[in-house]
């Protein structure tokens, strides 16, 4: 039967727990992204972030991911969700502020 | 290792039922969407039904919709392609699907496929 | 219903370039999806999001997509490149696969 949607941001989560423990070298090279408001269209607007990082195998699976929770199609410099684009941060710390965000979600059982 | 593998496939006659399961191993199948896509004999794919893991929505082809019915059940690891009043043109190997994730899955991509199940439908 | 059209056939000889095309209106709006298929064998995802290839994809697969055409394209094709190829995208809450084609390494 019907599966609560927690499963799909359980995995989520533990895909960029994965990133944060098996980082050794500079995640994607120490690439810069957007920061983004952590908010409503959250999962756009971190896919339209981490979209511009490219030959980062690192993260691959996570833009993958993302795209599952996001409902249009998101290119290479594409900003509609991206409302704010003003500070850049490191791919590392971005990763880590979105996994904080949704282990917060998730506790709260804000799963949409 | 990520597996998928189907059973329940058969000889059934003209306005027959049958069954499809679809084991899964190596993940957890409740976090993902789970497709059937069938193939005719020399032809091509043919999408046939979805079970999205967010909600547990269901998805059909036209040429499926009101005859099949999608499901699944987590406990198991199983999804199921319950077929009924089956006609000829229903003849094909039927592929489980390891599809997508998130409620926007069909945005992921169809990664894990079955070996698939023959499903022939005739008098 | 929305429909994906593509080539009956491509034939290509060994090294060369063999590029396929999927046409369906405003394609290039939905992500493309491409898969292999060999004979007697199970669909493979060999491209996803228009030009990603999965881990253990060889480098030589690459796809693109915009307007109303998705296209893949096998660089130096390889006579194991040899096999039946079917685009996919979703709309209006079905999946549609292409026609497919079928590659051959001359």
């Known amino acids: 039967g019907p599966v609560p949607p927690s499963t799909a941001l359980r995995e989520l989560i533990e895909e960029l727990v994965n990133i944060t423990q098996n980082q050794k070298a500079p995640l994607c090279n120490g690439s810069m992204v957007w920061s983004i408001n952590l908010t409503a269209g959250m999962y756009c607007a971190a896919l339209e972030s981490l979209i511009n990082v490219s030959g980062c195998s690192a993260i691959e699976k996570t833009q993958r991911m993302l795209s599952g929770f996001c409902p249009h199609k998101v290119s290479a410099g594409q900003f509609s969700s991206l409302h704010v684009r003003d500070t850049k941060i490191e791919v590392a710390q971005f990763v880590k502020d979105l996994l904080l965000h949704l282990k917060k979600l998730f506790r709260e059982g804000q799963f949409n | 290792e990520v597996q998928l593998l189907e059973s329940g496939g058969g000889l059934v006659q003209p306005g027959g039922s049958l069954r499809l399961s679809c084991a899964a191993s190596?993940?957890?199948?409740?976090?993902?969407?789970g497709s059937w896509v069938r193939q005719a004999p020399g032809k091509g794919l043919e999408w046939v039904s979805a079970f999205s893991g967010s909600g547990g929505s269901t998805y059909y082809a036209d040429s499926v919709k009101g005859r099949f019915t999608i499901s699944r059940d987590n406990s198991k690891n199983t999804l199921y392609l319950q077929m009924n009043s089956l006609r000829a043109e229903d003849t094909a190997v039927y592929y489980c699907?390891?599809?997508?994730?998130?409620?926007?899955?069909?945005?992921?991509?169809?990664?894990?496929w079955g070996q698939g199940t023959t499903v022939t439908v005739s008098s | 219903s929305y429909e994906l059209t593509q080539p009956p056939s491509v034939s290509v000889s060994p090294g060369q370039t063999a590029s396929i095309t999927c046409s369906g209106d405003k394609l290039g709006d939905k992500y493309s999806f491409w898969f292999q298929q060999k004979p007697g064998q199970s669909p493979v995802l060999v491209i996803y999001h228009d030009s990603k290839r999965p881990s253990g994809i060889p480098e030589r697969f690459s796809g693109s997509n915009s307007g109303d055409t998705a296209t893949l394209t096998i660089s130096g094709t390889q006579a194991m490149d040899e096999a039946d190829y079917y685009c996919q995208a979703w709309d209006s809450s079905t999946y549609v696969f292409g026609t497919g084609t079928k590659v051959t390494v001359l």
């Open positions: 699907v390891q599809d997508g994730l998130g409620p926007y899955f069909y945005n992921y991509g169809m990664d894990v």
């Open positions: 190596g993940f957890t199948f409740s976090s993902y969407a």
